[in-house]
Amino acid sequence: IIPVEEENPDFWNRQAAEALGAAKKLQPAQTAAKNLIIFLGDGMGVSTVTAARILKGQKKDKLGPETFLAMDRFPYVALSKTYSVDKHVPDSGATATAYLCGVKGNFQTIGLSAAARFNQCNTTRGNEVISVMNRAKKAGKSVGVVTTTRVQHASPAGAYAHTVNRNWYSDADVPASARQEGCQDIATQLISNMDIDVILGGGRKYMFPMGTPDPEYPDDYSQGGTRLDGKNLVQEWLAKHQGARYVWNRTELLQASLDPSVTHLMGLFEPGDMKYEIHRDSTLDPSLMEMTEAALLLLSRNPRGFFLFVEGGRIDHGHHESRAYRALTETIMFDDAIERAGQLTSEEDTLSLVTADHSHVFSFGGYPLRGSSIFGLAPGKARDRKAYTVLLYGNGPGYVLKDGARPDVTESESGSPEYRQQSAVPLDGETHAGEDVAVFARGPQAHLVHGVQEQTFIAHVMAFAACLEPYTACDLAPRAGTTD
């Protein structure tokens, strides 16, 4: 199945010459970025990117690795060191603080320097760090958050919240002692810390009082409002803006995104996280690509530009379950959103970054034949005379012993969307990994994204590119905001 043209050295020489020609034409833009987009693939380590690239190709009946993801087309790439101040291997809270605020923090804290301590409310005040999104808003730009998780989840919360515990989604999750000390839940901070123009994702239940039925699952008490303070945060948010609109399903979203009277849009499409792309009801819930498009339609109306955070948040969840099928199909939808955003924006005035907050203990190996299914088996057998998959996890729930031995696996089993790849160590949930992750960049000042950098560098590149604090004297032309 090897393409015959690939046996000829001319094929590779010609391909490389074309790539070299394109590289030679790259000119670092000396202009400021009017718009900033950061695409965050939660848990999207390099092994995930590679495997997703192959899957995307195989879904188009290609062999796989020769395919280009949308993110592969970005001309500048760096490596990001993801450790948090207190852990070699971080969580999504500490990493969000790094790439969105430009300061490293401690494990499971958000929007706080490392002087703050996990779960200790009294260490919050005075240790807040300000996100690039907040700085963009202060500079007159429109701002938005789009995610497939709940909008109060760790990664998006890094854009607007300051909390010593990433799990404080609603006030029901905050201990009474912390509430008395003045620590606010993340949902409250979502609507009160700053003015966010577009909020799209999951997380309805954290916005409504306990006992409020969910509009999609009205009979299911477990999906209804969770708030103990009796507040309807959606109502409070709507009251703040004349042109604010709240939607909870795909149809309403598509209508609102085209309505010129809508200036602020909140769309919460599930009580908690949104469903995996492979489980999504396409009439009720929008895809990440559709949410991204809707956000861009609204945000791009501002002549001063915008800041947009787009998260493929459930790549991480698929990996935690040791279900590579879920993680990789989420990665492909994330890449589709990147592609669509590229069609709706210009690299002349928009700096787009794609990165991950951390990796996972997810591996791809075993010398599989070119063109063989990414979910398939490695050639030959392991030392226990059993088959093994090319995708594996270092730890996680895929660890199973049957009669004291590792179970055999067939191609049909491993290709199932529900299959959990095997792991060396049994855990309820597979863990993050500590290796560096990629940062892809395109647009004004993208050339700054190079080498091996601290994860905090990402926030600083965005701030500098758009001449935001602390780089208002960035000396780039045209200066940010001159287009209005």
Partner: antibody, heavy 123, light 106 residues
Framework: EVQLVESGGGLVQPGRSLRLSCTAS????????MSWFRQAPGKGLEWLAL??????????EYSASVKGRFTISRDNSKSIAYLQMNSLKTEDTAVYYC??????????????WGQGTLVTVSS | DTQMTQSPSSLSASVGDRVTITCKAS??????IAWYQQKPGKAPKLLIH???TLQPGVPSRFSGSGSGRDYTFTISSLQPEDIATYYC????????FGQGTKLEIK
């Protein structure tokens, strides 16, 4: 409102074939996994076959007890799931149920069931 | 394939009694277990999914717990209308039912 209605059951001789239909309404058919189960008289419930949704390429799975004899399929334009049963045996006598998965907590739990259709295999 | 061992196969209890049914999986099913109630001539009715989440409209006397391979279904105070056969179902890896527990009133 989600509704599943099975049809096609009846009396059939051993060795013959039968096709069961499950007509679905009240939801976006292509977005959901569909499955067939059966229950022999006085016995427990047994899963037979599953067909996944559009996003996963309508792939299929079968229990070892029916693999090779039974085939699950779907006609998305009509919102119908089928179970083609070949080489029927007397032990295939049962009430056959069609079900739809719901993705709660990311698991494919069976929240919706049809009323069942009785298949009797006898000479 | 994942096997489910349900016990007891039958049980007799009085109105108001606390009733417990257990299911043991042949491997870790990661909390992907559901409990169904079936009455004669009817389709199974979902009571609980993901180990402990009650379906809409199901009385709070029904509950579930467990993790790993071991799971429990409890009726805190048996009512006459609870007379039925109860099944556990694992849905972590395809689907497997337990053998069922026939519940009768003393």
């Amino acid at each position: 409102e989600v509704q599943l209605v099975e049809s096609g059951g009846g009396l059939v001789q051993p060795g013959r074939s039968l096709r069961l239909s499950c007509t679905a309404s009240g939801f976006t058919f292509t977005d959901y996994y569909m499955s067939w189960f059966r229950q022999a008289p006085g016995k427990g419930l047994e899963w037979l076959a599953l067909i996944r949704n559009k996003a996963t390429g309508y792939t299929t799975e079968y229990s070892a007890s029916v693999k090779g004899r039974f085939t699950i399929s779907r006609d998305n334009s009509k919102s119908i799931a089928y179970l083609q049963m070949n080489s029927l045996k007397t032990e295939d006598t049962a009430v056959y149920y069609c079900t739809r998965a719901s993705f709660y907590y990311d698991g494919k739990v069976l929240a919706y069931w049809g009323q069942g259709t009785l298949v009797t295999v006898s000479s | 394939d994942t096997q489910m061992t349900q016990s007891p196969s039958s049980l007799s209890a009085s109105v108001g009694d606390r009733v417990t049914i257990t299911c043991k999986a042949s491997q870790d099913i990661n909390k992907y277990i559901a409990w169904y109630q079936q009455k004669p001539g009817k389709a199974p009715k979902l009571l609980i999914h993901y180990t402990s989440t009650l379906q809409p409209g199901v009385p709070s006397r029904f509950s579930g717990s467990g993790s790993g391979r071991d799971y429990t279904f409890t009726i805190s105070s048996l009512q006459p209308e609870d007379i039925a056969t109860y099944y556990c179902l694992q849905y972590d890896n395809l689907y497997t039912f337990g053998q069922g527990t026939k519940l009768e009133i003393k």
